[in-house]
């Protein structure tokens, strides 16, 4: 009922075709020392098989190069095969600033990240850099900040601003798209001792983002001319029973608690959504919860309001929801929402339902509520058990991109990019990657390549072309040189 026939058409010429990776752990030393050692060795191949240094001989060395990092070489090979125009990856805050402040800057880590960006640019691949990407097992904070109460401590927001400033300064000449924080609206999974913990941590995350954005706007934008936002987890919600009013209300409430919670203060009013504040207050009045959203001062509202240059959404699936009154003072119970798994739907091994039309509804809802701004889908993908012919991923990509195209062509949503999640999978984690954990390519890569080179799903005889300046053209000489580099 919700699906509409596929459309034929193309995305705009300046559309970003991306792939997302989570945190890149920096290599501490270049893994190819053979070019920086000035000594000559003789290899005793038939005897003890050891290298013996020849004294008194010094060879000319060459300067260290970015591709001395084995990890970078691997990434470049994968990215070159993906044919993407953009690569989204996250820095490791704890590696860059182990002490949590600028007293000890890990220059080697910053050099590594600069190498990732600059080598990508040689392939015609621009970076979208995420400053802070908390993973649920590990908060990704520098140890001293973690031990000082993490995001429950307002000073963490100031520490984040200092870290962001360092990254803007060191990488900003090469990076034009920044994400401050990935999915702050999902940190409720960690700060879940009470609703007040959740809302307090969220408040400090909002402030941290706003401080970083204001710093960029004031100090770096004039020269670097980049754009800064934060990525929100943004699954769509549908009423489990479309004939029940309470389910419709629950679906809207899910969106308010999940997306508007962060979007409203930043994109619109500088304050939390009235619907969310009122719902929590009403439960509080009835003695069903002791939670309360923080009261914002006028100064805080001014600080938060308007601190986004674009809207960044991570969208994976659609959830079917119903109303269920829950007691307790935690974020999950404050929403009064129960999720239903529809077993008739095509789903992944981690039970992510494939519901393509949800992304179009989401984009329409965002546009309707927050205005006609540039929107990037900064992560979207599915786990697929297959190690070679990942048909579920191909189906997912094709259908979800169709719905994004409808949002652009028909709903006139200003969609600027789609970043597939993710580049390579991690061992013993759900298989979201286009490459296996030992870097073997899957067949979905060719599918994504085809969509990228066609700029979507064009008519057979489509004459639509982009001028050279608009379209990202691959430099074959650069590619050749990169592949031949040691």
């Amino acid at each position: 009922k919700e699906s509409t026939p596929d459309v034929q058409g193309q995305f705009p010429c300046d559309f970003s075709w991306g792939v997302t990776e989570s945190v890149l752990k920096p290599e501490s030393v270049a893994s190819s020392p053979q070019f920086s050692d000035p000594h000559l060795y003789v290899w005793n191949a038939t005897g003890n098989r050891l290298l013996h240094r020849v004294e008194g001989v010094r060879l000319k060395t060459r300067p260290a190069q970015c591709t001395d990092f084995v990890n970078i070489k691997k990434q470049l090979e994968m990215l070159a095969r993906m044919k993407v125009t953009h690569y989204r990856f996250a820095l490791d805050w704890a590696s860059v600033l182990p002490t949590g402040n600028l007293s000890a800057v890990n220059r080697q880590a910053l050099r590594y990240y600069r190498c990732v960006v600059s080598e990508g640019l040689k392939l015609g691949i621009s970076a979208m850099v995420t400053l802070y990407y908390p993973t649920h097992a590990h908060l990704g904070l520098p140890e001293p900040l973690l031990h000082a109460d993490g995001w429950l401590n307002p000073s963490t927001a100031e520490a984040f601003q200092a870290y962001a400033g360092l990254c803007f300064q060191e990488l900003g000449d090469l990076v034009k798209l920044w994400i401050t924080i990935n999915e702050p609206n999902r940190l409720s999974d960690i700060y879940n001792r009470s609703g007040n913990d959740t809302y307090g941590a969220a408040h400090n995350l909002l402030v941290a983002h706003a401080l970083a954005w204001r710093l960029y706007d004031r100090q770096f934008r004039p020269s670097q001319r980049g754009a800064v936002s934060l990525s929100l987890h943004a699954d769509w919600a549908e009423p489990a029973n479309p004939y029940a009013d309470s389910h419709w209300r629950a679906a809207e409430r899910f969106l308010q608690f999940e997306i508007a919670w962060f979007a409203e203060p930043l994109f619109k009013t500088g304050d939390y959504p009235a619907a969310m504040r009122e719902y929590i207050a009403s439960k509080h009045r009835r003695g069903l919860s002791s939670s309360a959203l923080p009261r914002l001062t006028e100064a805080e509202r001014r600080l938060l309001k308007g601190t986004v240059d674009f809207c960044a959404l991570n969208h994976f699936t659609t959830r079917f929801v119903m109303h269920e009154q829950l007691a307790g003072s935690r974020y999950d119970s404050d929403r009064d929402i129960q999720f239903l798994q529809d077993i008739t739907r095509l789903s992944s091994p981690t039970r992510l339902a494939v519901i393509p039309w949800g992304v179009r509804k989401l984009l329409r809802w965002v546009r309707r509520n927050y205005g006609d701004m540039d929107i990037y889908i900064t992560a979207s993908g599915i786990d697929d058990q297959a190690l070679e012919d990942d048909r579920l991923r191909k189906y997912y990509l094709g259908k979800y991109l169709q719905e994004v195209l409808k949002a652009y062509l028909i709903d006139k949503v200003r969609i600027k990019g789609y970043y597939a999640f993710k580049l390579a999978e991690e061992k013993s984690k759900p298989r979201f990657g286009f490459f296996t954990s030992d870097f073997k390519a899957k067949s979905s890569i060719q599918f994504y390549n085809k969509v990228i080179s066609s700029r979507g799903f064009p008519f057979e005889n489509s004459s639509s072309r982009c001028s050279q300046t608009q379209e990202n053209t691959e430099c074959t000489v650069c590619l050749f040189l990169v592949q031949k580099k040691p």
Partner: antibody, heavy 116, light 107 residues
């Protein structure tokens, strides 16, 4: 204030050609899709077609695809409709409008009369 | 192409009446219907998007409903300035066809 100002209408002979223009002010023209709609005297509205912000996508109503060409010049904030092989059935008031996605801003229209 | 059929063609009403204008699509178009009002010698004006969502600046007496293939524009308490022709439009897929219009006149 948002303004859409159509021009270029007038009397044209059957089989002839005409280029209509729509000058836009008050919005960031280069960021928006634009449409043409026409209305024959005493009749209803007919959607002609639309063009994307970067001109890479242009959609037409199938019956008019071969005789009308929509284009735009973002530097001049202007939308165009090139009409060719006109017939008396093309006599109408031609409006430019912004689809976002419904047509929320309209010009006053320019009248095209096809007559020998 | 999706055909949009409006009824009635003409509607004569008394100020203060509640009126309903109907629009039927030749196939299901979810909630992709837009309503416009066109007064004599004026350009059309957008009233409702996505079948039921109101537009800022439009009087609250105008409301829309429907989903699938049957849609209704309601005017809660008709005022003399509401005279004109009302059009529905398919916004589901191109070509974005219009209905033939319903002319609203005051008795």
């Amino acid at each position: 204030e948002v303004k859409f100002l159509e021009s270029g209408g007038g009397l044209v002979q059957p089989g002839g050609s005409l280029r209509l223009s729509c000058a836009v002010s008050g919005i960031d023209f280069s960021r928006y899709w634009m449409s043409w709609v026409r209305q024959a005297p005493g009749k209803g509205l007919e959607w002609i077609g639309e063009i994307s912000p970067d001109s890479s996508t242009i959609n037409y109503t199938p019956s008019l695809k071969d005789k009308f060409v929509i284009s735009r010049d973002n530097a001049k904030n202007t939308l165009y409709l090139q009409m060719s092989k006109v017939r008396s059935a093309d006599t109408a008031l031609y409006y430019c409008a912004r689809p976002s996605p419904a047509l929320d801003y309209w010009g006053q229209g320019t009248l095209v009369t096809v007559s020998a | 192409d999706i055909v949009m059929t409006q009824s009635p063609a003409t509607l004569s009403v008394t100020p203060g009446d509640r009126v309903s204008l109907s629009c039927r699509a030749s196939q299901s178009i979810s909630d992709y219907v837009y309503w416009y009002q066109q007064k004599s010698h004026e350009s059309p004006r957008l009233l409702i998007i996505y079948a039921s969502q109101s537009i800022s600046g439009i009087p609250s007496r105008f409301s829309g409903s429907g989903s699938g293939s049957d849609f209704t524009l309601s005017i809660n308490s008709v005022e003399p300035e509401d005279v004109g022709v009302y059009y529905c439009q398919n916004g589901h897929n191109f070509p974005y066809t219009f209905g033939g219009g319903t002319k609203l006149e005051i008795k």
